[in-house]
């Protein structure tokens, strides 16, 4: 969490941002809140990106002002206009690109004063893994697949019964480049699995950590997946 205060001139206002990560090809949110003002027409929101010649987004007098928007953000940004009055300056970024990563500044002017706060925005690809029994294999085998990751993640297998065991000798992981030549499909195979055990396939890079669990018994198979972003720090 980054909390910024205003500088010079009028009183300072508190602006708060939260570091976040964007999944390339999907829409992302750059979070920013501020002390609200009673008049929408008195609020100016500017989003800037370090090292960029134009603005990321500007909202003033109750509407978008995009005359000085940088070309790399053209047609891809929006604020939540109906929530600005209550202090939400968050920015929606459409079709996140790898090059959107960097340091952003949320700069606010209201009748109470000015304030700004920076946020770090990471970009990459992350997806939920799915673990299945590979019935085509000669021995009992599990196959963990996740369609989109970038940068290349690490894959670690774990088991509930053999806690602390190292499965690197009995697993094989491959990374297959997807058609857009950036993200990769992750496939990891675990051999010699035993029945009545829960296995976890953990995929992690510097942006996200995802886990796919599978419990195999003689009567049923239970699956569970979850994904966690690693860098959500508020400022």
């Amino acid at each position: 969490l980054i909390i910024g205060f205003g500088i010079s001139g009028r009183h300072s206002i508190t602006v708060t941002t939260v570091a976040s990560a964007g999944n390339i090809g999907e829409d992302g949110i750059l979070s920013c809140t501020f002390e609200p003002d009673i008049k929408l027409s008195d609020i100016v929101i500017q989003w800037l990106k370090e090292g960029v010649l134009g603005l990321v987004h500007e909202f003033k007098e109750g509407k978008d002002e995009l005359s000085e928007q940088d070309e790399m953000f053209r047609g891809r940004t929006a604020v939540f206009a109906d929530q600005v009055i209550v202090g939400n300056a968050s920015l929606r970024l459409k079709n996140v690109q790898l090059t959107d990563a960097g340091t952003y500044k949320c700069y606010i002017i209201t009748s109470k004063g000015k304030g700004n706060a920076n946020l770090e925005y990471k970009t990459g690809a992350f997806s939920m893994p799915e673990v299945n029994v590979d019935y085509n294999a000669s021995s009992e085998t599990l196959r963990c697949e996740a369609p989109r990751w970038f940068p290349q993640p690490t894959v670690v297998w774990a088991s509930q019964v053999d806690q602390g065991a190292n499965f690197s000798e009995v697993s094989n992981t491959s990374f297959e480049l997807n058609s857009e030549n950036v993200t990769m499909k992750v496939v990891s195979v675990l051999y010699n699995v035993t029945i009545n055990n829960t296995y976890s396939c953990m995929i992690e890079n510097d942006i996200a950590k995802a886990t796919g669990d599978i419990k195999v018994t003689e009567s049923e198979i239970k699956r569970r997946s979850h994904l966690q972003l690693l860098n959500s720090k508020a400022s």
Epitope: L48, V52, E68, E71, A101
Partner: antibody
């Protein structure tokens, strides 16, 4: 201490190509946009091209659009200018300069290289 | 692209003189204007940015003013080391444009 050092200039025939480099040191290179500026012999300054800190945006003067390509390698702290289809009027000293860090807030063109001479002649 | 027109293109002045150079933009560039000084055979040097902000290390005899389309560089008391060519430069759009330059010579 901030330093910018251009290289790659020289004599080239019309229609030829040349690649200029600018090695940067003394500052966080990826935090700044960078520009190329040229100066023909006895003439004024002409902005040529700029690139954002992360390399996601590139900008060109109309006179070089479609012929020149600006790029950067932040891992090497180096800025490049690939110049193709060179013409006699491209003859100039080419400078790299540190451009803006934050829109509307920071100085720009506060540091310059010493320049590298490009001569286009048959 | 925004065009920048400087005047005069050259001027002769004496040490101690007050010198004023003007720069006009073809359309508004807000306050996104810089002034640079160049001496023969040297790279340009930034003097003023954001129309009126003095770059660190630049003597206080240099000052800038204006906004929108009309800008002025003033040297309050010309010194021997100030004889050089001065350029205005806009950065209010993605392109950066320089004026054609003003050469300040010794009278």
């Amino acid at each position: 201490e901030v330093q910018l050092l251009e290289s790659g200039g020289g004599l080239v025939q019309p229609g030829g190509s040349l690649r200029l480099s600018c090695a940067a040191s003394g500052f966080t290179f990826s935090s700044y946009a960078m520009s190329w500026v040229r100066q023909a012999p006895g003439k004024g300054l002409e902005w040529v091209s700029a690139i954002s800190g992360g390399g996601g945006s590139t900008y060109y003067a109309d006179s070089v659009k479609g012929r020149f390509t600006i790029s950067r390698d932040n891992s090497k702290n180096t800025l490049y200018l690939q110049m193709n289809s060179l013409r006699a009027e491209d003859t100039a000293v080419y400078y790299c300069a540190r451009d803006i860090q934050w829109y509307g807030e920071s100085t720009l063109f506060d540091y310059w290289g010493q320049g590298t001479l490009v001569t286009v002649s048959s | 692209d925004i065009q920048m027109t400087q005047s005069p293109s050259s001027l002769s002045a004496s040490v101690g003189d007050r010198v004023t150079i003007t720069c006009r933009a073809s359309q508004s560039t807000r306050s996104w204007l810089a002034w640079l000084q160049q001496k023969p055979g040297k790279a340009p040097k930034l003097l003023i940015y954001k129309a009126s902000s003095l770059e660190s290390g630049v003597p206080s005899r240099f000052s800038g003013s204006g906004s929108g389309t009309d800008f002025t560089l003033t040297i309050s008391s010309l010194q021997p080391e100030d004889f050089a060519t001065y350029y205005c430069q806009q950065y209010g759009s993605y392109s950066r444009t320089f004026g054609q330059g003003t050469k300040v010579e010794i009278k």
